[in-house]
Amino acid sequence: ASNFDCCLGYTDRILHPKFIVGFTRQLANEGCDINAIIFHTKKKLSVCANPKQTWVKYIVRLLSKKVKNM
């Protein structure tokens, strides 16, 4: 659901955190149409996710805590 570097929509699947290695924030006021979290998976895929959904917030927080503790 992305066009060049911008997400145009969100995944309708819930991704398990064990497959995710990192994320990037997409902000609507920085050249893209929507706010999104772009999850980067172990298989080198980029998945656009809705930053308002609780599962997305949980994973972002888990990854942020991992980075902080490194």
Epitope: I14, P17, N50, K52, Q53, T54, W55, Y58, K68
Partner: antibody, heavy 121, light 111 residues
Framework: QMQLVQSGAEVRKPGSSVKVSCKAS????????ISWVRQAPGHGLEWVGG????????DYAQNFTGRVTISADKATKTVYMELRSLRYDDTAVYFC??????????????WGQGTMVTVSS | QSVLTQPPSASGTPGQRVTISCSGS????????VNWYQHLPGTAPKLLIY???QRPSGVPDRFSGSKSGTSASLAISGLQSEDEADYYC????????????FGTGTKLTVL
Amino acid sequence: QMQLVQSGAEVRKPGSSVKVSCKASGDTFNNFAISWVRQAPGHGLEWVGGIIPVFNTADYAQNFTGRVTISADKATKTVYMELRSLRYDDTAVYFCARTKIELDNDAFDIWGQGTMVTVSS
Amino acid sequence: QSVLTQPPSASGTPGQRVTISCSGSSSNIGSNTVNWYQHLPGTAPKLLIYSNNQRPSGVPDRFSGSKSGTSASLAISGLQSEDEADYYCAAWDDSLNGPYVFGTGTKLTVL
């Protein structure tokens, strides 16, 4: 419609541990987060921690990190909260509450009935 | 340890309109939606408003919520005696201290 049924009241001595359970019925266990929220006498609501059972990954409020463990048994649709090194000020009613993780809101729409934990010597 | 600030008390007479404020910061209310809970002593809290201004089914339209910047408010119109309770705002917090934070709580008295 999901219901959350919690275990009964507990009395513990300072320094000991308590494990409270929250059993879900009436719906699948998928796509939910279960949080624990407490209210001490004369105080407000306080988020203790939560778990997404399908992830089997828990998260805790900074105040409780290292002293609390939240776990889930998917087979019995039960979430547990264990609080260790109990202090007098851990005396509170502990509630479990549900969030639907696939919605774009993080509200607790269903709550357990509460479990009173008393820390007393 | 609440990071959302509410007035400790509010009051009104039956039929009146009362408003309860909730003040936060850019990491919680500023970047996330606000929920409101009603809590009667001896019972479980009840979800009153979610996503700033949405009412779950069964909640009367006398209850309404709004958000502006880093603050939110709950309005109760046509106040009734059964509205006497504690009210809490809550929001996800993007800082690493705790992902879900509650307000300090407001005790509403119906005179």
